[in-house]
């Protein structure tokens, strides 16, 4: 039995997985960040997790996904006050009773420091110093992102 | 209907201790941020202190930093303050407002409960 | 810290007049920026909110205006009930902060 959230979240996924391949992203969108190789979109409204997590679909890229330490602190850093908290696309899985990524990959426990309960309605937020448990209808401000193409030099073959 | 009811304050010495309670009815206590704010009399207004929905995160402002405690109990939608080392400057009406994560505005508030710090 | 400079500090006006109250940031705060009313003795009350958004169940009378350091308050035709002392503040950084009051008292 999956939760109102988690059906959100893997309707979403799959709707993603269904639209067709588009060229590759080389440069960030005017109002997006880079941040290595992701463009990042901090939203300046709040919204309910599952409200951001629709958003970002709307602009064809997803709930922050961070895949380690040094990663979420280079995000930290562009986080202007500290009393912002932000949306990421980690929310508790009830029915696998874990932290589980809106791409389908549980939470490696060394990743994230989260203060607070891992229980049924808990989603991820994070703010200038800390990552937070909070109730997933709680209003708050959200990262998108979109990944970035690698560009690759290409090799012609001799004429 | 949103209410916010707080109670505690009352006359303390300076150095003194106080808690201050607000009970909260009417809204999804947990998913909201709250916040503290003061008011000296015949004064403005004073933004105290603030905790998130689950009570994770607090912030306070600098006069109170390290004298002062927020804390929440979602399980009986209760907001606390409390507050050490009181001095004569402490002097106010206590409010407590829904809201105080940025960009939040307080858009509901208690009726206020007022701290007398005198010797 | 933001500082945050309300003008007048009091005025006097008539009933059905129009009322102007500003404020003025120390440095730039986008659209964060708020306006309470508040009454003797009662706790403050939410008119606006993001500079011009108007509070739900507040008068159409109010409104705000203003983005980056300067704002303001506007009540287009004064009531017997709006005579209060009024506050901007700014939620663009910690620590959140008030303008000083302005008192709109009757003529």
């Known amino acids: 039995q999956k939760s109102s959230i988690e059906k959100c979240s893997v309707d979403i996924q799959q709707s993603r997985n269904k639209t067709t391949e588009r060229p590759g992203l080389l440069n960030c969108p005017i109002y997006w960040q880079q941040l290595r190789e992701k463009c990042l979109l901090f939203s300046h409204t709040v919204n309910p997790w599952n409200n951001s997590l629709a958003d970002c679909s709307t602009k064809e890229s997803s709930l922050l996904l961070i895949r380690d330490k040094d990663e979420l602190i280079h995000t930290q850093n562009l986080i202007r006050d500290k009393a912002i908290l932000f949306w990421i696309g980690l929310n508790f899985s009830l029915s696998e009773k874990n932290w589980k990524w809106i791409n389908g990959s549980f939470l490696n426990s060394n990743d994230l420091e989260i203060r607070g309960d891992a229980k049924e309605n808990s989603c991820i937020s994070i703010s200038q110093t800390s990552v937070y448990s909070e109730y997933c209808s709680t209003e708050i401000r959200w990262i998108c992102q979109k990944e970035l193409t690698p560009v690759r030099n290409k090799v012609y073959p001799d004429s | 209907e949103v209410q916010l009811v707080e109670s505690g304050g009352g006359l303390v010495q300076p150095g003194g201790s106080l808690r201050l309670s607000c009970a909260a009815s009417?809204?999804?206590?947990?998913?909201?941020?709250m916040s503290w704010v003061r008011q000296a009399p015949g004064k403005g207004l004073e933004w105290v202190s603030a905790?998130?929905?689950?009570?994770?995160?607090?912030y306070y402002a600098d006069p109170v930093k390290g004298r002062f405690t927020i804390s929440r109990d979602n399980s009986k939608n209760t907001l606390y303050l409390q507050m050490n080392s009181l001095r004569a400057e402490d002097t106010a009406v206590y409010y407590c407002?829904?809201?105080?994560?940025?960009?939040?505005?307080?858009?509901?508030w208690g009726q206020g409960t007022l701290v007398t710090v005198s010797s | 810290e933001i500082q945050m400079t309300q003008s007048p500090s009091s005025l006097s006006a008539s009933v059905g007049g129009r009322v102007t109250i500003t404020c003025r940031a120390s440095?730039?705060?986008?659209?964060?920026l708020n306006w309470y009313q508040q009454k003797p003795g009662k706790a403050p009350k939410l008119l606006i909110y993001?500079?011009?958004s108007l509070q739900s169940g507040v008068p159409s009378r109010f409104s705000g205006s203003g983005s980056g350091t300067d704002f303001t308050l506007t009540i287009s035709s004064l009531q017997p009930e709006d005579f209060a002392t009024y506050y901007c503040?700014?939620?663009?950084?910690?620590?959140?902060?008030f303008g000083q009051g302005t008192k709109v008292e009757i003529k």
């Open positions: 407002a829904r809201g105080g994560y940025l960009p939040d505005a307080f858009d509901y």
């Open positions: 009417g809204f999804t206590f947990s998913s909201y941020a």
């Open positions: 905790i998130s929905g689950s009570g994770g995160s607090t």
């Open positions: 440095q730039s705060i986008s659209s964060y």
């Open positions: 993001a500079a011009s």
């Open positions: 503040q700014q939620t663009y950084s910690t620590p959140l902060t």
